[in-house]
């Protein structure tokens, strides 16, 4: 890692240490502790507080981002004294120089582009490096195929998305021969950044009075089941007066998909097209292909 | 009509092991991911166990853990439960039940349940 | 002893509305995890009623909503039927049990 670690503790110290790759705070154990805490404060004052792992010399932090800088604070009783420690993380290197707007999305159930801006003040040289790593901080994901602009990785593609969980944290260090490049780290949830395909297996049957539309739910990423979805249907007469109205549906998920609606014969030529959303973010899907019923004589 | 039907009620001698079966009829079992739940008088219902998206596995009730097997047989759309080393207080009605979502998990629908008497 | 707790019973009126109340714990509800809320009426099996705290599953009446707030839930009922006579239960997941966990039940009688 880049970032340097400076040290604020008084004579006897406990040696805390940090590994930004297991987000483990460490210290040498002391004889008789009766009492132990370790928490983070960050820019905004913020406190995180993990629990202390069994043998109370280490705690893990989960859900955090370092790139802003923090401060880690160590507390130890025994029963002779006290010990306090803090251990300040900056984010080294020249301001301005960490990969900026930086974002995610999964496609196609089993795909996923990052894309990220080299930094205002970052030099010529400057090369940023994609890092994943899973919530149970099992895997490190190294990106496999970057993309570049001018020779500078400015965003990444995986096909291969087995290593990561419903939330997962994103690393891009930089490096350059001239300055320190400082880092930026992200939190994401796999939920929040797939963009689901249109339903498929899209069909109407008409009889005489009713039209009955059926779907598939489409292919995810996430493992979601049929009460996740909501669907949208544009019913939509053709040749109508430009401006008018489409119908839209919202449709609940259900196991078996369907939309019943009256319709009678004879009946003029309708095309409906569905969309697909998790039903707790609505982040609608693209429109299937349009299916045409009907005729041009109804 | 998606519909579970579940094997007849069962008597067993405590330390004896009970199978539970439950027919999946107008969807593919394949697509779906099977729960087991079990409701006493006294402690109401308690979930144990069935496939976590998060692990891609079945996961089982820690209280549960070593006793129980859930497994499929997807050619024939059937999932089983099978509890062993039997004792009175698993005395119960065991559902089974389809995952309509993972978070929580949301269960619908239910099988009818089948009724499990343990006794000497 | 359930790990959400509910009231054992609560009545109203036909017509009237009654809300269950489910309080859990940093570990379930206040995670936070969804609340699930089901029916179950005599001698039947449980039916979704609600599903990630505040969704209906189609063919559920909007007579019955839920809220969460915190550690706790509700189910409100509003113009009780008689048919609605039923025990209710409430689910969640929790994260110290790596499982999910059930209320006791509420008996909700039609008065």
């Known amino acids: 890692e880049k970032s340097d670690l400076r040290t604020v503790a008084p004579a006897s110290s406990l040696n805390v240490r940090f590994d930004s790759r297991t987000m483990n705070l460490s210290w040498d154990c002391q004889e008789n502790t009766t009492f132990s805490k370790c928490f983070l404060t960050d820019k905004k004052n913020r406190v995180v507080e993990p629990r202390l792992s069994n043998n109370e010399c280490s705690c893990t932090f989960r859900e955090i981002c370092l790139h802003e800088g923090v401060t880690f604070e160590v507390h130890v009783n025994t029963s002779q004294r006290g010990f306090q420690q803090k251990l300040l993380y900056p984010n080294s290197g020249r301001e301005g120089t960490a990969a900026q707007n930086f974002s995610c999305f999964i496609y196609n159930a089993d795909l996923m582009n990052c894309t990220w801006a080299r930094g205002p003040t970052a030099p010529r040289d400057v090369q940023y490096f994609l890092y994943i790593r899973n919530s149970k901080r099992r895997r490190e994901i190294r990106c496999p195929y970057y993309i570049q602009d001018s020779g500078t990785h400015v965003g990444c593609h995986l096909d291969n998305l087995s290593g990561l969980t419903s939330r997962n944290y994103f690393l891009v260090n930089g490096t350059s021969r001239e300055i320190g490049i400082q880092f930026f780290d992200s939190l994401l949830d796999t939920k929040k950044i797939e963009r689901f395909n249109p339903p498929s297996n899209v069909t109407v049957r008409c009889n005489t009075t009713h039209c009955l539309v059926r779907w598939k739910q489409p292919r995810t990423y996430q493992k979601l089941s049929y009460l996740d979805f909501q669907y949208q249907l544009d019913v939509h007469r053709k040749n109508t007066q430009p401006g008018t109205e489409n119908l839209l549906i919202n449709v609940s998920g259900d196991l078996e998909n369907r939309y019943n609606f009256p319709s009678s014969e004879p009946r003029a030529k309708h095309s409906v097209k569905i969309r697909a959303a998790d039903v707790r973010i609505l982040n609608w899907s693209s429109w299937s292909e349009a299916i045409e019923f009907g005729s041009d004589d109804g | 009509q998606v519909q579970l039907v579940q094997s007849g009620a069962e008597v067993k001698k405590p330390g004896a092991s009970v199978k539970v079966s439950c027919k999946i009829s107008g969807h593919s079992l394949s697509e779906l991911s099977i729960h087991w739940v079990r409701q006493t008088p006294t402690k109401g219902f308690e979930w144990m166990g069935g496939f976590d998206p998060e692990e891609n596995e079945i996961v089982y009730a820690q209280r549960f853990q070593g006793r129980v097997t859930m497994t499929e047989d997807t050619s024939i759309d059937t999932a089983y439960l099978t509890l062993s080393s039997l004792r009175s207080d698993d005395t119960a009605v065991y559902y089974c039940?389809?995952?309509?979502?993972?978070?929580?998990?949301?269960?619908?629908?239910w099988g009818k349940g089948t009724m499990v008497t343990v006794s000497s | 002893q359930a790990v959400l707790t509910q009231p054992s019973s609560v009545s109203g009126a036909p017509g009237q509305r009654v809300t269950i109340s489910c309080t859990g714990s940093g570990s379930n509800i206040g995670a936070p995890y969804d609340v699930s809320w089901y029916q179950q009426l005599p001698g039947t099996a449980p039916k979704l009623l609600i599903y990630h705290n505040n969704k209906r599953p189609s063919g559920v009446p909007d007579r019955f909503s839920a809220s969460k707030s915190g550690t706790s839930a509700s189910l409100a009922i509003t113009g009780l039927q008689a048919d609605d006579e039923a025990d209710y239960y409430c689910?969640?997941?929790?994260?110290?049990?790596?499982?999910?966990?059930f209320g006791g039940g509420t008996k909700v009688t039609v008065l």
């Open positions: 039940s389809i995952v309509g979502s993972f978070s929580g998990p949301a269960l619908r629908p």
């Open positions: 689910q969640s997941y929790d994260s110290s049990l790596s499982g999910s966990v």
